[in-house]
């Protein structure tokens, strides 16, 4: 009878073991273990009847295909074999063991005791067959194995061979080299590679296989395993294989597809080819006068490009357009894409107008071509050139006016400050106690008229200011605050401010420049109680043109000391000019200024301590702060007064000989202007220079509107 065994291990014994086995007995044990395992069989005890070539009693171990061993007897002889210590392995996962005893036993034989177990097959070391072994890497595990591939390869669906993904190779250059994957190492199996050479129509691709050419072939059948096929337009070339490379191929096409296919076996080096594209030739381009062509070649064919440039100082001229270079290309029909341009001398063209400046040509006939020269200058004496540069510009090879300091940037004409075209007199006779100014004596003087329409009825008043640049007026903060609430600082709206410059007689404003305000900036710390920080700016809506009657005043250098005591300064204004007229008496004069013609006065700076003491001795709460200074005479008679507010107290700077705004008319009193020991109090401008530049946006030429010590 037959016993089926499916366990991973087990024991097999002769019938009746350990007693003697019966005569005329036959038992077969069929052992089956899972795939990936083999069976190991060994005997712990073996005692069978001896016979020549085991013809009586025996144990036969076999597979489906072969007998692995036949055992009998008690010990091994020349004609019979006992298992002894021998281990029997099945090649596969099946083993059959048959025990047979004949009809008689001369003595008592105890039979056998055998053991079997499933053992793992190491497929990685045991598989010789290329059809079954792993292409690259083999990994054994208990009960099986698996394959993997080197970097850049993919495992084929057969789970054994390694292929490459090589179907997206597109070549668009005019020359190139194409190889089989891994060349010159053996190419991968089970792969299908596509290579496309795709060039512009007009090119023709030729292919040249190189020295090594090794593709698996067959002696009888043409290229059944691995091969190359080439498709060019309607033509299909190949298949090619073996060890002899194809002859050079002129495809006569701009588009070529190469197919390379490998099967799942073989070890061959592969192939390498170079390709190049050729096209129709164009005639040699003609060299323009004053020009050059790059690159210089013996011949030029389809798609070749040449760059035409000109000598230094010349420009390429094509269709009346100037350019630095011009490129032409050889077309598929053997003609150039464009006619060769000419070279024209670089022309910088008419130089840009300079705001507040003039242009002089240094070259004859006002030439503006390469190496010509011009000179910029500023409208003197009202403007001067920033950085004091020469203003000489040369026409560069690039056709741009260039200056050695500024490059292609234009110069800047900055207003000249503190230098009136009419000199201020050294001596001034005894605003109060002043005299009429001549037109142009105080070209920085501004009349500020404020009409506050936010109140009903409208409020109207005026004050003075000083021009700092083409766009900014310096004045006192109290001039630009709403008058209706004496204890609040509400800046007037910019719409309510009008500024007059170049004004002499308020009855005739025809010659003056009037401007509205773009911005009104009061010092953020202006204190209405004590007039501390009484300083403000008005930005004009449009820059004003400078001239003999409109010029800026200079700002001082930022010094906390301010002007030195006893220094003489000038101040101008349209305020009260008659010391005998009281404030009450002039109420009837309406809203016009109190003096028709600009007045001015010369006043000495009063020592700070003297001024501070003179105000502290009064009954009111008067505070002369570090941001103020005083000017005037102990005996009175000369002073600034109502309506002069915001005007500049100017002092001549010895070094630069320029007039500097050291103070702004701020306050005084409570007695009538020009009274004995009633000094005028002025805002100390030097304490606010940094704040002023911050508001105005510090110009490059800060030094040109500020006198540095």
């Amino acid at each position: 009878h037959t016993v089926e065994l499916n366990n991973m291990f087990g024991q097999i014994q002769s019938p009746g073991y350990p007693d003697s086995y019966p005569s005329d007995s036959e038992v077969t044990w069929n052992i089956t273990v899972p795939e990936g395992f083999r069976i190991k069989l060994y005997f712990m005890h073996f005692n069978l009847e001896s016979s020549y070539l085991c013809e009586y009693d025996y144990v036969k171990v076999e597979t489906e295909e072969q007998v692995l061993a036949t055992f009998c007897g008690r010990e091994t002889t020349d004609t019979e074999q006992t298992p002894g210590q021998e281990v029997v392995f099945s090649p596969g996962s099946f083993m059959s063991i048959t025990f047979r005893s004949d009809f008689s036993n001369e003595e008592r034989f105890t039979g056998f005791d055998a053991h079997y177990m499933a053992v793992d097959v190491d497929e990685c070391t045991e598989r010789e067959d290329e059809e079954l072994s792993c292409d690259h890497y083999c990994h054994n595990y208990i009960g099986g194995y698996y394959c993997s591939c080197r970097f850049g390869y993919l495992l084929h669906t057969d789970n054994r061979t390694c292929r490459v993904e090589c179907s997206d190779n597109v070549y668009t250059q005019r020359t190139g080299v194409i190889t089989s994957p891994d060349f010159p190492n053996p190419y991968p199996k089970s792969s299908e590679c596509f290579y496309t050479i795709e060039l512009e129509e007009g090119f023709m691709v030729s292919l040249q296989f190189e020295d090594i050419f090794d593709i698996e072939d067959h002696p009888e059948v043409p290229c059944p395993y691995d091969y190359i096929k080439i498709k060019a337009g309607p033509k299909v070339l190949g298949p090619f294989c073996g060890e002899k490379a194809p002859e050079p191929i002129n495809t006569e096409s701009h588009s070529v597809q190469i197919l390379f296919r490998s099967d799942n076996s073989g070890e061959n080096q592969g192939w390498r080819l170079s390709y190049r594209a050729t096209g129709n030739e164009c005639p040699d381009p003609e060299l323009p006068v004053h020009g050059k062509i790059e690159p210089l070649q013996a011949t030029y064919s389809f798609k070749d490009q040449v760059l035409i440039s000109c000598d230094t100082g010349y420009k390429v001229l094509k269709d009346n357009v100037e350019m630095d270079t011009f490129q032409i290309e050889c077309l598929k029909d053997g003609t150039w894409s464009n006619r060769i341009p000419t070279c024209k001398i670089a022309d910088c063209g008419a130089p840009a107008e300079l705001k507040h400046g003039l242009i002089t040509f240094s070259t004859r006939n006002n030439l503006t071509t390469y190496k010509s020269e011009i000179q910029y200058s500023c409208q003197q004496p009202y403007y001067k050139m920033l950085h004091n540069i020469t203003g000489v510009y040369t026409c560069s090879a690039q056709g741009v006016w260039m200056n050695e300091v500024l490059g292609r940037s234009q110069p800047t004409c900055l207003p000249v400050c503190g230098q009136p075209s009419r000199s201020l007199p050294n001596l001034v006779k005894r605003i109060i106690g002043g005299r009429n100014a001549e037109p142009g004596l105080f070209p920085w003087q501004a009349l500020i008229v404020v009409e506050d329409t936010s109140r009903v009825p409208n409020d109207k008043w005026f004050g003075s200011g000083a021009l700092l640049s083409e766009s900014w007026i310096l004045t006192a903060a109290h001039v630009l605050r709403s008058q209706r609430r004496d204890n609040t600082v509400t800046p007037v709206s910019k719409e309510h401010v009008t500024v007059y410059l170049g004004l002499h007689d308020v009855r005739d404003k025809s010659g003056a420049v009037n401007s509205s305000a773009a911005q009104v900036v009061l010092h953020p710390d202006f204190n209405i109680q004590n007039y501390n920080h009484d300083i403000a700016l008005v930005q004009l809506r449009e820059p004003v043109p400078l001239g003999p009657h409109v010029m800026p005043i200079c700002l001082p250098s930022p010094e906390p000391e301010g002007p030195e005591p006893h220094m003489l300064g000038l101040v101008a204004g349209w305020g009260i000019s008659n010391p005998n007229v009281t404030v009450d008496e002039i109420i009837s004069s309406g809203t016009r200024t109190l003096s028709d013609v600009l007045q001015y006065v010369k006043l000495p700076v009063v020592p700070y301590a003297e001024c501070k003491t003179s105000y502290e001795s009064r009954s009111g709460n008067y505070s002369v702060t570090e941001n103020m200074f005083c000017a005037g005479y102990y005996e009175g008679g000369k002073d600034t007064c109502l309506g002069d507010s915001g005007g500049a107290f100017v002092i001549l700077d010895d070094l630069s000989q320029r007039w500097v705004a050291q103070g702004l008319v701020s306050w005084g009193g409570p007695e009538e202007c020009g009274s004995k020991q009633v000094y005028g109090v002025y805002t100390k401008v030097s304490n606010y220079v940094d704040w002023l530049w911050e508001q105005m946006g510090s110009p490059q030429g800060l030094g040109d509107l500020q006198v540095e010590r």
Epitope: V456, P457, V583, I587, T591
Partner: antibody, heavy 113, light 112 residues
């Protein structure tokens, strides 16, 4: 002509807030200050403060700081005054006026528990 | 704050009579820059809103009868009604706007 029309009478509980409105017609609203005045019998007229609608600038009487808040909506030409933490002392007639000249119709506020 | 004092607090006159009422401020209301006295006079009739009569101490508002006249400067101001009419029955207030505005206590005009 210039007119200032104020919102209707308000009866409020102590601790509550009220927002009074003043709609201007007949002039450019943004360009003139709007003032607010309180009138209580036996107490005369008290100036509360003002707002310039075009800029939102405000000035307050110290006495009313924290009590009154001014706002303005230029799109509807309307000024507003909010009175907070109401007490019986806030019961009064409230007027808006254009700067110095034209007075509103007045709004009566009564605070009662 | 500037204190405004009105006198008398009330007065009764017959139609056609001349009336003078006073308003004094605790400090000058003259702004030296604009050369204006920031003082206004208002009339408030019973049950109505106040109405502007005089601004800048002496300028009559348009539409106000010329029997109303304002005068004064600095700290002393006067409102005069040259010939009182029955419709002038009202309380008259002065207001300063030189500083944070303040009102006088008012003068009540009654017609006999």
């Amino acid at each position: 002509q210039v007119q200032l029309k104020q919102s209707g009478a308000e009866l409020m509980k102590p601790g509550a807030s009220v927002k009074l409105s003043c709609k201007a017609t007949g002039y450019t609203f943004t360009g003139k200050w709007i003032e607010w005045v309180k009138q209580r019998p036996g107490h005369g007229l008290e100036w509360i403060g003002e707002i310039l609608p075009g800029t939102g600038s405000t000035n307050y009487n110290e006495k009313f700081k924290g009590k009154a808040t001014f706002t303005a909506d230029s799109s509807s030409n309307t000024a507003y005054m909010q009175l907070s933490s109401l007490t019986t002392e806030d019961s009064a007639m409230y007027y808006c006026l254009r700067s110095e000249d034209v007075w509103g119709t007045g709004t009566t506020v009564t605070v009662s528990s | 704050d500037i204190v405004m004092t009105q006198s008398p607090s009330s007065l009764a006159v017959s139609a056609g009579e001349k009336v003078t009422m006073s308003c004094k401020s605790s400090q000058s209301l003259l702004n030296s820059r604009t050369r204006k006295n920031y003082l206004a006079w208002y009339q408030q009739k019973p049950g109505q809103s106040p109405k502007l009569l005089i601004y800048w101490a002496s300028t009559r508002e348009s539409g106000v009868p010329d029997r109303f006249t304002g005068s004064g400067s600095g700290t002393d101001f006067t409102l005069t009604i040259s010939s009182v009419q029955a419709e002038d029955l009202a309380v008259y207030y002065c207001k300063q706007s030189y500083n944070i505005p303040t009102f006088g206590g008012g003068t009540k005009l009654e017609i006999k």
